[in-house]
């Protein structure tokens, strides 16, 4: 019968030792047994549970020439980079015949400098705005005391008086570094150093100062920026679109915004070369040497209507007896709003001017008084929007109409000069 088949006779001649060390340590546990006959497979237990994926090696040495002679079996369990999860009671286990044998236990313990589970992270904060930082460390040995540092200077050092895992900072006015030190019976470890960058606060009260058809003047109140003066503010504008869905807090519009920089102070900017009677969304952020603030919410604004920038085109006026037929086309120049209609004025050499509102039609037949005897009759036309009348056309003389002839068309030879229209405005 193989050695160790009786319950009281253990085959183990060497039991696992003890390992105590710091995180990252590499160590080996070893157990040795002497058996008669075929050597068994050695299993390792941690806290009574078989380790399925153990990094173990087994060496078997026969003590005789016969298979039934004794064998020395050595099993080694390698622990690489010791962690808290490796700690516990270790034993070897073998099955011999119908019996199970377990070695005496060895213990693996972790003891060293504090180990950081959480360290303060770099972040940006608005000036004078509260925030929290986290730091967490563990042993063993416990307890672990934390000491918070700002710019490497302790914040609270009296035991039990300082903050532990979470540090509440009521606000900063300058970019600062924060770290924590963890103290236990084995020593002190310093965390990484987190840089907290102080950015300007978000500007407030973005509003319109004045509106013109192609120009908006906007102003805002800057937020606090700590010890760092603001260098400039950046305004973004985007053409509004009903389907665009810019909400108050929506971070970005779906199309590329158009950007303009403003020197500060004053905290004001004139946006020119805009489309009249057009909705926009605008927002502003201000920048210091440390970086930009967050953007304000998108503010919906709209340029007002303007008057048409040019007169109606291709005006023709023909006369047939006591009737005059006048025809024109919409102005080629920008209307700067919604066209509400046309006004027409006609006048003879010695007669008072007659003014008519034609509405949106582009032709009219005039009934002339005095049986058409009025001489040198001329016609002018202007387009208008809600903002008022655009420029009048040059006077067009009434031509006599002869059957078989096309109605004469008078091209305007001179128009009021239109302002140069350029997009974008920045």
């Amino acid at each position: 019968a193989p050695r160790g088949t009786q319950a009281e006779e253990s085959p183990f001649v060497g039991n696992p030792g003890n390992i105590t060390g710091a995180r990252g340590l590499t160590g080996t546990l070893r157990c040795q047994l002497q058996v008669q006959g075929e050597p068994p497979e050695v299993h390792w237990l941690r806290d009574g549970q078989i380790l399925e994926l153990a990094d173990s090696t087994q060496t078997q040495v026969p003590l005789g020439e016969d298979e039934q002679d004794d064998w020395i079996v050595v099993s080694q369990l390698r622990i690489t980079s010791l962690q808290l999860s490796d700690t516990g009671q270790y034993q070897c286990l073998v099955f011999l015949g119908h019996q199970t044998f377990v070695s005496q236990p060895g213990y693996v313990g972790l003891e060293g400098l504090p180990y950081f589970l959480e360290e303060p992270e770099d972040r940006t904060v608005a000036a004078n705005t509260p925030f929290n930082l986290s730091c967490q460390a563990q042993g063993p040995p416990e307890p672990v005391d934390l000491l918070w540092l700002q710019d490497a200077v302790p914040l609270a050092t009296a035991p039990g008086h300082g903050p532990q895992r979470s540090l509440h900072v009521p606000g900063l006015n300058k970019t600062s570094s924060f770290s924590c030190e963890a103290h236990n019976a084995k020593g002190v470890t310093t965390s990484r150093t987190a840089t907290i960058t102080v950015l300007p606060q978000q500007p407030r009260n973005l509003h319109l100062v004045s509106r013109q058809p192609t120009e908006l003047e906007v102003a805002w109140t800057p937020g606090l920026s700590g010890i760092y003066p603001l260098t400039h503010c950046t305004l973004q504008a985007v053409l509004s679109d009903d389907g665009m869905g810019i909400q108050a807090g929506e971070p970005d519009p779906p199309e590329e915004p158009l950007t303009s920089q403003a020197s500060v102070p004053p905290h004001q900017l004139r946006l020119g070369s805009l489309h009249p009677h057009t909705p926009y969304h605008i927002r502003v952020a201000c920048t210091s040497s440390q970086g930009p603030s967050s953007w304000t919410h998108w503010l919906p604004v709209e340029t007002p209507e303007g008057v048409p920038l040019g007169p109606p085109e291709n005006i023709s006026a023909t006369r047939n007896g006591s009737q005059a037929f006048v025809h024109w086309q919409e102005p080629r120049a920008p209307l700067q709003g919604t066209l509400l209609g046309y006004r027409l004025a006609y006048q003879g050499q010695d007669t008072p001017e007659v003014l008519m509102d034609i509405g949106l039609r582009q032709e009219v037949t005039l009934e002339l008084q005095g049986d058409g005897s009025v001489s040198n009759l001329t016609v002018c036309v202007a387009a208008y929007t809600a903002a008022g009348d655009g420029p009048w056309s040059l006077p067009v003389p009434l031509e006599a109409w002869r059957p078989g002839q096309a109605q004469p068309v008078h091209q305007l030879v001179k128009e009021p000069s239109t302002p140069a229209f350029s997009w974008p405005w920045w």
Partner: antibody, heavy 115, light 107 residues
Framework: EVQLVESGGGLVQPGGSLRLSCAAS????????IHWVRQAPGKGLEWVAG????????YYADSVKGRFTISADTSKNTAYLQMNSLRAEDTAVYYC????????????WGQGTLV | DIQMTQSPSSLSASVGDRVTITCRAS??????VAWYQQKPGKAPKLLIY???FLYSGVPSRFSGSGSGTDFTLTISSLQPEDFATYYC?????????FGQGTKVEIK
């Protein structure tokens, strides 16, 4: 004005004992610790022991562990270094320095005492 | 323990020179490095802490930089009173360990 003054140095036989004192003024030991640093003749600086500003721990260099003991009497604002089983290689000027935090560096030092 | 290796061990320089001393840690110490100046027969004086913070009262010609394992102390324009021995020290963990020192001598 912050000041640290060491005393207690002197000539001692190998195997003998000495107790160094470090009297602090201008600050209190509450929330502050003390380092002991030594400098052998013509050599560099070597940290010996320390009491940190938090907890109730004491730390030692491996070279003195089991032989030296650091302590502090907050009522007297004085730190001590009890040195037993002294060896020839312990010969040095011993400085005490303030320990506010490890990261802050040793910002105030005493003038040193020769052992 | 973390080893701190300073270079050079000594250097000769003239007043007005720019002097650079380097220190290398045997493992990452983040920015936990201090620099000290020591004159013969005197206690060391703190110059720089946390790698780059100038200690109160130290002239601005002294500056520190670096993180991880490589650190530098720079004296932008050497003055007569700057001839001394300079030590780096890691403060990442206990035991705090010092470099072997760099002696700055008059050329």
């Amino acid at each position: 004005e912050v000041q640290l003054v060491e005393s207690g140095g002197g000539l001692v036989q190998p195997g003998g004992s000495l107790r160094l004192s470090c009297a602090a003024s201008g600050f209190t030991f509450t929330g502050t610790g003390i380092h002991w640093v030594r400098q052998a003749p013509g050599k560099g600086l070597e940290w010996v022991a320390g009491i940190p500003p938090v907890g109730s721990y004491t730390y030692y260099a491996d070279s003195v562990k089991g032989r030296f003991t650091i302590s502090a009497d907050t009522s007297k604002n004085t730190a001590y270094l009890q040195m037993n089983s002294l060896r020839a290689e312990d010969t040095a000027v011993y400085y005490c320095a303030r320990w506010r935090s490890l990261s802050s560096g040793m910002d105030y030092w005493g003038q040193g005492t020769l052992v | 323990d973390i080893q701190m290796t300073q270079s050079p061990s000594s250097l000769s320089a003239s007043v007005g020179d720019r002097v650079t001393i380097t220190c290398r840690a045997s493992q990452d110490v983040s920015t936990a490095v201090a620099w000290y100046q020591q004159k013969p027969g005197k206690a060391p004086k703190l110059l720089i802490y946390s790698a780059s913070f100038l200690y109160s009262g130290v002239p601005s010609r002294f500056s520190g930089s670096g993180s991880g394992t490589d650190f530098t102390l720079t004296i932008s324009s050497l003055q007569p009173e700057d001839f001394a021995t300079y030590y780096c020290q890691q403060s990442k963990t206990t035991p705090p360990t010092f470099g072997q020192g760099t002696k700055v001598e008059i050329k």
